[in-house]
């Protein structure tokens, strides 16, 4: 069951506030509050910002990275921090906002000829066509002159949604993050009722596609809060 997976199978070496409910792709019930949503803290305001403890960059939103909140602070206490914009200092690619990568300690723009996650060596895989894509996270690795032009197809390992092809987002799937399809009209989605509430979502869903929003399905209005079904609906 979902609970047994959460409580006993996925063992997180993380601080206490983790282990919220997880949304199954295609499940009949929307996930409970307290779930990491693609994009993470970027929808929060300063007023209601709640630090989200983490152990690795993948546990943070697409515009965040995992680090100690204070310079030279306790290495054991790490939270998701807002990504660094262009020309800001960095130590690894994940610290830089989407569209940028870390070069010589500074976040610089990823132009067409550069992949933000230039990595130690070529890690490509064939998709049975003439194109290939990065297979592996682009974080905590050294620079090289290798270049990548193509985006990850469905199922490819990713770090951020910008690593994935159009119509896909980067979402957690057990111990990896992979490119998954952006949700279509009528598909079950994950609605987060409380801004700033996070939990580690084992099967992260993508967000709803363009022109759609995640809303309670009309015939589920009478249901209890915990069992309301959310689907992607036209604005």
């Amino acid at each position: 069951t979902l609970n047994s997976v959460l409580n006993s199978n996925a063992i997180k070496n993380l601080p206490p506030p983790l282990g919220g409910a997880a949304g199954h792709p295609g499940s009949a019930v929307s996930a409970a509050p307290g779930i990491l949503y693609p994009g993470g803290n970027k929808y929060q305001t300063i007023d209601n910002y709640q630090p989200y403890p983490c152990a690795e960059d993948e546990e943070c939103g697409t515009d965040e990275y995992c680090a100690s909140p204070t310079r030279g602070g306790d290495a054991g206490v790490q939270i998701c921090l807002a990504c660094r914009k262009r020309r800001k200092r960095c130590m690894r690619h994940a610290m830089c906002c989407p569209g940028n990568y870390c070069k010589n300690g500074i976040c610089v723009s990823s132009d067409q000829n550069h992949f933000r996650g230039e990595i130690e060596e070529t890690i490509t895989e064939s998709f049975g066509n003439d194109h290939s894509t990065l297979d592996g996270y682009s974080r905590r690795t050294t620079l090289s002159s290798k270049m990548y032009h193509t985006k990850g197809q469905e199922g490819s390992v990713c770090l951020r949604s910008s690593d994935c092809a159009s119509g896909l987002c980067c979402a957690r799937h057990f111990w990896s993050k992979i490119c998954k399809p952006v949700l279509k009209e009528g598909q079950v989605c994950t609605k987060h009722r409380r801004k700033g509430s996070h939990g580690l979502e084992i099967f992260q869903r993508c967000y709803c596609g363009e022109g759609l929003s995640c809303r309670i399905q009309k015939d589920h209005h009478q249901a209890s809060n915990s069992s309301r079904l959310h689907t992607c609906q036209r604005h």
Epitope: V5, N9, E56, E125, Y137, T141, G155, V157
Partner: antibody, heavy 118, light 107 residues
Framework: EVQLLESGGGLVQPGGSLRLSCAAS????????MGWVRQAPGKGLEWVSA????????YYADSVKSRFTISRDNSKNTLYLQMNSLRAEDTAVYYC???????????WGQGTLVTVSS | DIQMTQSPSSLSASVGDRVTITCRAS??????LNWYQQKPGKAPKLLIY???SLQSGVPSRFSGSGSGTDFTLTISSLQPEDFATYYC?????????FGGGTKVEIK
């Protein structure tokens, strides 16, 4: 070229312990989740455990939970499987494997045989 | 747990034959289905991931199809080196589970 080399297998008595190692080379180790899969003699494949790239997230099959511990040392490019309270049914060839697209295991080691017998 | 049922469990075929192996999941697994080939005394080798994507270096005579619960591995023209055991695997839910295997033997 991706290479995964397991070691640490052998004969052990029921209730005993073993630690398997998997030395990885030819790819950026920290960027990949890794896993262990086993195969009992003459039988099919059974997933045992997996660990995220950073090592912060681990998963286990129910049959080994609380007895086996997966870990990794990214500074040494090495994956481990600590096996305690071994049982006869744990006898198998243990493979270490790299987790790729769709969480498929896209590269495998040659395997190391673990025999649990009195 | 999600059960993966492969059929047939074994088959005999000749070089040049078209071979089809099926795999059925006990519940929908979308396209989270992978196929492996294993020869005696050797480690498994990934052939197909995501139901239909050919792994790098795998000959194009291998193809995969399906979505949901029913999947197929096809070898369009069997070659001598293809005689082996084939396994399907789902990665939609933990525990990850494999099919029982299909042994392809020489007729």
């Amino acid at each position: 070229e991706v290479q995964l080399l397991e070691s640490g297998g052998g004969l052990v008595q029921p209730g005993g312990s073993l630690r398997l190692s998997c030395a990885a080379s030819g790819f950026a180790f920290t960027t990949y989740a890794m896993g262990w899969v086993r195969q009992a003699p003459g039988k099919g494949l059974e997933w045992v455990s997996a660990i995220s790239g950073s090592g912060s997230t681990t998963y286990y099959a129910d049959s080994v939970k609380s007895r086996f511990t997966i870990s990794r040392d990214n500074s040494k490019n090495t994956l481990y499987l600590q096996m305690n309270s071994l049982r006869a049914e744990d006898t198998a060839v243990y493979y270490c494997a790299r987790s790729g697209s769709f969480l498929s295991f896209d590269s495998w080691g040659q395997g190391t045989l673990v025999t649990v017998s009195s | 747990d999600i059960q993966m049922t492969q059929s047939p469990s074994s088959l005999s075929a000749s070089v040049g034959d078209r071979v089809t192996i099926t795999c059925r999941a006990s519940q929908s697994i979308s396209r989270h289905l992978n196929w492996y080939q294993q020869k005696p005394g050797k480690a498994p080798k990934l052939l197909i991931y995501g139901a239909s994507s050919l792994q790098s270096g795998v000959p194009s005579r291998f193809s995969g199809s399906g979505s949901g619960t029913d999947f197929t591995l096809t070898i369009s023209s069997l070659q001598p080196e293809d005689f082996a055991t084939y396994y399907c695997q789902q990665t939609y839910r933990t525990p990850l589970t494999f099919g029982g295997g299909t042994k392809v033997e020489i007729k």
